[in-house]
Every structure is written in C-alpha cells, then in structure tokens.
Interface confidence: low
C-alpha cells in the first residue's frame, strides 16, 4: 500500500492464533523522515488505541495494553499471551511529519485450545 510517499507492506493480513500465544503483527514501511506509527484495535465492542510512537523513541502504550505489547522500529508490534478477546482488527497508520499517511489492517483470530485438539 502506498500513499503520498508513505508505503506500507503487510506480509500477513490474517493471523490465526490460539490463547496464550505471543503474536507478531508484522509490517514494513518506508517514507521520508521519521514517521509517527499508530496501532488501533477494533472489534464489535468498539475501537481503542493500542500504541503510538516515533521509531527511535519510547512508545506511548495505552493503559489497556500496558505490559502486553512491545514495539519494533519497523512498525511491527508483538502481543503477549493473547486471549480470545484480542480477536479483531488491528489497524496501523504510518504518518509522515507533514501529515501524509497510509493505513493497513491485520485481522487476528484467537481461538481456545480444544481438548480434542491435544490428541
């Protein structure tokens, strides 16, 4: 995806996971200068901001995801020990200093480990 000099690549747009897994929401971007990266989470319950940061600086992680997420300077984030309630749409927006931006979405499906799956 590319817009106004910001390009964004999402290698895996849909991720299937089971509870308690650590999940990498992987992206790559390129743009002029140092952008602001923002991830938001949407589900049937609404939308909330997860984290916002400029690569090379400390991330501003929302209270709802404190200690549950870490950021990488390529724009990716890792979610720790996911639960079923983490299922939903994860939207990344990469914004250049002058305001141009691009967004992309990763869909995360988290399921319980069923007893029969263990046999």
């Amino acid at each position: 995806l590319q817009s106004q000099g910001v390009s964004l690549y999402i290698p895996q747009a849909t991720i299937n996971a089971t509870v308690k897994e650590d999940i990498l929401l992987s992206v790559e971007y390129s743009c002029h200068g140092v952008p602001t990266i923002e991830w938001t989470y949407s589900s049937n319950w609404g939308t909330q901001k997860i984290v916002e940061w400029k690569p090379g600086t400390q991330a501003n992680i929302s209270q709802s995801h404190k200690d549950r997420v870490c950021t990488f300077d390529n724009g990716s984030i890792q979610l720790f020990s996911v639960g079923v309630r983490d299922s939903g749409y994860y939207v990344i927006t990469v914004t250049e200093r002058l305001g141009s931006s691009q967004f992309g979405t990763i869909v995360l499906h988290v399921s319980e480990i069923l007893y029969e799956d263990l046999h």
Epitope: L1, Q2, S3, Q4, T36, E38, T40, K49, E52, T93, T95, E96, L98, G99, S100, S101, Q102, F103, T105
Partner: antibody
Framework: EVQLVESGGGLVQPGRSLRLSCAAS????????MHWVRQAPGKGLEWVAV????????YYADSVKGRFTISRDNSKNTLYLQMNSLRAEDTAVYYC??????????????WGQGTLVTVSS | QPVLTQSSSASASLGASVKLTCSLS???????IAWHQQQPEKGPRYLMK???????SKGDGIPDRFSGSSSGAERYLTISSLQSEDEADYYC?????????FGGGTKLTVL
C-alpha cells in the same frame, strides 16, 4: 455515542472577529486530531484547519492562513476556531470533524451538524 | 497537490445500483481517499476510507449496500439496492502534506 456540537456562529461584519467552539463527547478527545471544514451556501466542502491530538501540530488552508487559529482544550473536550479579519467569502456553515487518528491529518470519521457564520455589513 | 474530480450529478432508480467515480489527478494515482455522504440540510457523514488497491474500511453503521473499489487513478463508490434516503451529495476527499482536498461532489438523485 460520538457527538460533536458546534456553537458560536452568527452574523458578523467584515473585518470583525468570531470564535467558534466544538464540544466533543463519546470518545477520548485527547487522543485524536480534529478538523474544521466549511461549506459556503450552495457550494461544496472546503477544509479549513487541523490540529493534532496534543495541539503540537496545526495546519491551515491557504485561504485562511494568518487570519484563523485552531486550538483545543483537552481538559474541556473542546475544539476552537478563532476567526479574525473576516471577509464576505468566509460566509459558510462551519463543521467540526474528528480525525480517525491522533497525529496525521487523514480523514474524518465523525462530523458535527455545523454552525452558520454570516459575514455581511 | 492532488486534485479530485467528480461528476456533478448522477441518477438511478429505486432498488437499482449506482457507481460514483472520483478521479485523482496525474501523479497521484496511489493516493488513498475517503467518501462522505451529505443528505439534504444535514451535516456530512463518513462512509469509508479507500486504498489504491481497493481495500477499504467503512464507518460505524454504514450498510453493506455501500462498497468501494479502485482502478488506477479512479476511486469508486457503489451503492446497491438504492433507497430514497441515499439521495444526497457524495464527496470524495484525500489528504497530503498538511493539506486536505475535497472533490466537488456528486449530487445523486434516486428516481
């Protein structure tokens, strides 16, 4: 439910000033960039100004640059537009709009109902 | 700075489908846009954000009858099963380096 309610419009003489307000509710106001967009009678939409979530970045349309100032008070969940040196061509309905994101001027996922500003002698 | 071009008017029959077009100026074919609807005497309403590859994210409560697609520098809004309340002005919008740009709007009449 997200609500944006504009106020402060009215009839004003050319060269005078006016301040518009937009009261926001139903979302975390301090987390999102906010815009003003206007619509002259019978015309299309024209973007006026944007301010980032924390007020650190502001951008203006060329037509209002140097005359209008956008600001916000996150403690009051309120967006402002200070309009100075008003001209007849500033006559329009002024809409407050919420950006989808915090920093970037991208697009608006919620709009207010607007307040009418009429500049006439 | 990008320029967005829209037809000034369009019409279609109740229950039919209509496809509105927004054209990006030369050199801006990769830009994402948004579509907004403005019913008579009301404020605008956000419909969707539309990427150059056709992927889109819709606003809260926007019916499935509204969909977006892209081809080159063209961005489309398709409304199927037209209803009387779809009669409105439709604006496309894009964003760039500290600026916002609107198309001139398309007035949709439902016959």
């Amino acid at each position: 439910e997200v609500q944006l309610v504009e106020s402060g419009g009215g009839l004003v003489q050319p060269g005078r000033s006016l301040r518009l307000s937009c009261a926001a509710s139903g979302f975390t106001f301090s987390s999102y960039a906010m815009h003003w967009v206007r619509q002259a009678p019978g015309k299309g939409l024209e973007w006026v100004a944007v301010i980032s979530y924390d007020g650190s970045n502001k951008y203006y349309a060329d037509s209002v640059k140097g005359r209008f100032t956008i600001s916000r008070d996150n403690s009051k969940n309120t967006l402002y537009l200070q309009m100075n040196s008003l001209r007849a061509e500033d006559t329009a309905v002024y809409y407050c709009a919420k950006d989808q994101y915090s920093v970037g001027a991208t697009t608006y996922d919620y709009w207010g109902q607007g307040t009418l500003v009429t500049v006439s002698s | 700075q990008p320029v967005l071009t829209q037809s000034s008017s369009a019409s279609a029959s109740l229950g039919a489908s209509v496809k509105l077009t927004c054209s990006l100026s030369s050199g801006h074919s990769s830009y994402a846009i948004a579509w907004h609807q403005q019913q008579p005497e009301k404020g605008p309403r956000y419909l969707m954000k539309l990427n150059s590859d056709g992927s889109h994210s819709k606003g809260d409560g926007i019916p499935d009858r509204f969909s977006g697609s892209s081809s080159g520098a063209e961005r489309y809004l398709t409304i199927s099963s037209l209803q009387s309340e779809d009669e409105a002005d439709y604006y496309c919008q894009t964003w760039g380096s500290g600026i916002q740009v609107f198309g001139g709007g398309t007035k949709l009449t439902v016959l």
